[in-house]
Interface confidence: low
Amino acid sequence: NTHDDCQVTNPSTGHLFDLSSLSGRAGINASYSEKGLVFMSICEENENCGPGVGACFGQTRISVGKASKRLSYKDQVLQLVYENGSPCPSLSDLRYKSVISFVCRPEAGPTNRPMLISLDKQTCTLFFSWHTPLACEQATECTVRNGSSIIDLSPLIHRTGGYEAYDESEDDTSDTTPDFYINICQPLNPMHGVPCPAGASVCKVPVDGPPIDIGRVTGPPIFNPVANEVYLNFESSTHCLADRYMNYTSLITFHCKRGVSMGTPKLIRTNDCDFVFEWETPIVCPDEVKTQGCAVTDEQLLYSFNLTSLSTSTFKVTRDARTYSIGVCTAAAGLGQEGCKDGGVCLLSGNKGASFGRLASMQLDYRHQDEAVILSYVNGDPCPPETDDGEPCVFPFIYKGKSYDECVLEGRAKLWCSKTANYDRDHEWGFCRQTNSYRMSAIIFTCDESEDIGRPQVFSEDRGCEVTFEWKTKVVCPP
């Protein structure tokens, strides 16, 4: 099923998918290594490339396909094909071509952008996968009720790649490559070098051919009260080799097993067309988190993460021209820092400071899906002003050669600010409006055995209102 206007309908349900909100000549960058980018626009030409070109290499602007609005739908995957790019350097009779598959990912995340999953030099084709909520027809539930409590499998969703599983019945013990890649509740994430069909949640990797789809999400988990088990069913449209009248199906059965490990799926039986996996995990056990002082205990893992050793000093981290002072269960900066007397995280600016969350509001949590301890502070100072069209003001900004740290009246009837650091150069501005929000911060601690104390890094900043830090340290490594 295909449309020509960046829209397409699922013929079996009538649901209209519309990717036009992803369009824009500015486009987005897809990386094929840290130094290699592809500039790409969806359903229209990219301003960094030549006329009519939808995608091109960032280094060279070489076209990897002409823009097209022709969107197709098959097996829960939307596809856009850009053909007739520049001649391929290695095969002069071929031209670059790009195939962009859009796969459902319910929540936007850091990987919510196109990713190159494989390059076919024989056909000079680049295969991209973009996991986006716009490719979702309905929200996939990853929870199931067990009486009054809810079992939530979402912490097991693999956010990058997928889980690896092996066929233990195979004789060849020297073969270390996985036989299956698995994700739950949503499709496998794109994996460079493992071209599993876009949209598959269970993917079988044969010894002598390309990976095959043996299961796609069909619905939420199912609880069997008699066996006290949680099941997840997957169906595919791939014909089974052993029986052409059958399609492959997969089933995962989850059992409670307390401990630090989240577990992984293991193949327990197959009849060539149906695959049954078992997954022992604490996720389906009754859950509880307890906080005491600067420590959080996860009842599933039966382990206490203690951050006290990080609370003896404050840490400074700089990004661009902004320096943050960070306290772990302690105030961020000394009394000399105005505005940060009770802040857990403080943005330093001269002898002033802006609190990104009060120490008294501190919360500790453990997040299974990321295997991370999260320390959060809320109710800091008011968020900085934004323009009346909702875009953030950038402070400080240069206007007529002078630097300004707040909204100004100069030259206009109302308070205004620049949307970039240099108004004189960019001339982008808006009238100021105050927000009703308060600054907040979060520190995500993840295990790294090679880092004793480690150091925080700025992970993300949002409108000068929220800041997230990433902190790799052995302090949060489970035993």
């Epitope: 094929y32 840290e34 290699g36 280094q59 060279t60 070489i62 460079h192």
Partner: antibody
Framework: EVQLVESGGGVVQPGGSLRLSCAAS????????MHWVRQAPGKGLEWVAV????????YYADSVKGRFTISRDNSKNTLYLQMNSLRAEDTAVYYC????????????WGQGTTVTVSS | AIRMTQSPSSLSASVGDRVTITCRAS??????LAWYQQKPDKAPKSLIY???SLEDGVPSRFSGSGSGTDFTLTISSLQAEDFATYYC?????????FGQGTKVEIK
């Protein structure tokens, strides 16, 4: 014929400065990222720095950060490496290399120029 | 920085031998690995890019394989002109890093 020719090497005292050049010919220089790689006597290869096709992005090895500056002049098809605060351990053959435009890596190399830092 | 470890550091072989050099990365580098050949007092020459793709003009007796952290360069039948030092190099993450080199000598 695609060619890279380095020049500017020589003997310099510790703490001194030197500027290396790399003249490119036979390809559209302004379409490629460019690298400097060095090799100390009897040792292996060490990547030094890279500059993007338009000069907007630069990355350096930790060992030279703050001392070396990579730059380019696309109108002259020339790549440069400004080396300041030179140390004895900077003694090496310096190669310029072209970045592969599709799959990465360095597909074309110059013949190298020798830098000796000695008092 | 990503560490690249090559083995062996040197080997002796005869013309016609099959030679295998391995390279291990300290973390996942996907397929972003190149192999170079260097002869005494000469500049390095690119042999293989993207772990397994042969540069134009490189004889087919050279082949590369691997992804993730483990990679291999194989010379199926060693020729007299192949005696040289071989380097692997990752370009997944800056700073780019090389292996320490493998010297292939005549037995």
């Amino acid at each position: 014929e695609v060619q890279l020719v380095e020049s500017g090497g020589g003997v310099v005292q510790p703490g001194g400065s030197l500027r290396l050049s790399c003249a490119a010919s036979g390809f559209t220089f302004s379409s490629y990222a460019m690298h400097w790689v060095r090799q100390a006597p009897g040792k292996g290869l060490e990547w030094v720095a890279v500059i993007s096709y338009d000069g907007s992005n630069k990355y350096y090895a930790d060992s030279v950060k703050g001392r070396f500056t990579i730059s380019r002049d696309n109108s002259k098809n020339t790549l440069y490496l400004q080396m300041n605060s030179l140390r004895a351990e900077d003694t090496a053959v310096y190669y310029c290399a072209r970045d592969d435009r599709f799959f990465g890596g360095m597909d074309v190399w110059g013949q190298g120029t020798t830098v000796t830092v000695s008092s | 920085a990503i560490r690249m470890t090559q083995s062996p550091s040197s080997l002796s072989a005869s013309v016609g031998d099959r030679v295998t050099i391995t390279c291990r990365a300290s973390q996942d580098i996907s397929s972003w690995l190149a192999w170079y050949q260097q002869k005494p007092d000469k500049a390095p020459k690119s042999l293989i890019y993207a772990a397994s793709s042969l540069e134009d003009g490189v004889p087919s007796r050279f082949s590369g394989s691997g992804s993730g952290t483990d990679f291999t360069l194989t010379i199926s039948s060693l020729q007299a002109e192949d005696f040289a030092t071989y380097y692997c190099q990752q370009y997944n993450t800056y700073p780019w890093t090389f292996g320490q080199g493998t010297k292939v000598e005549i037995k």
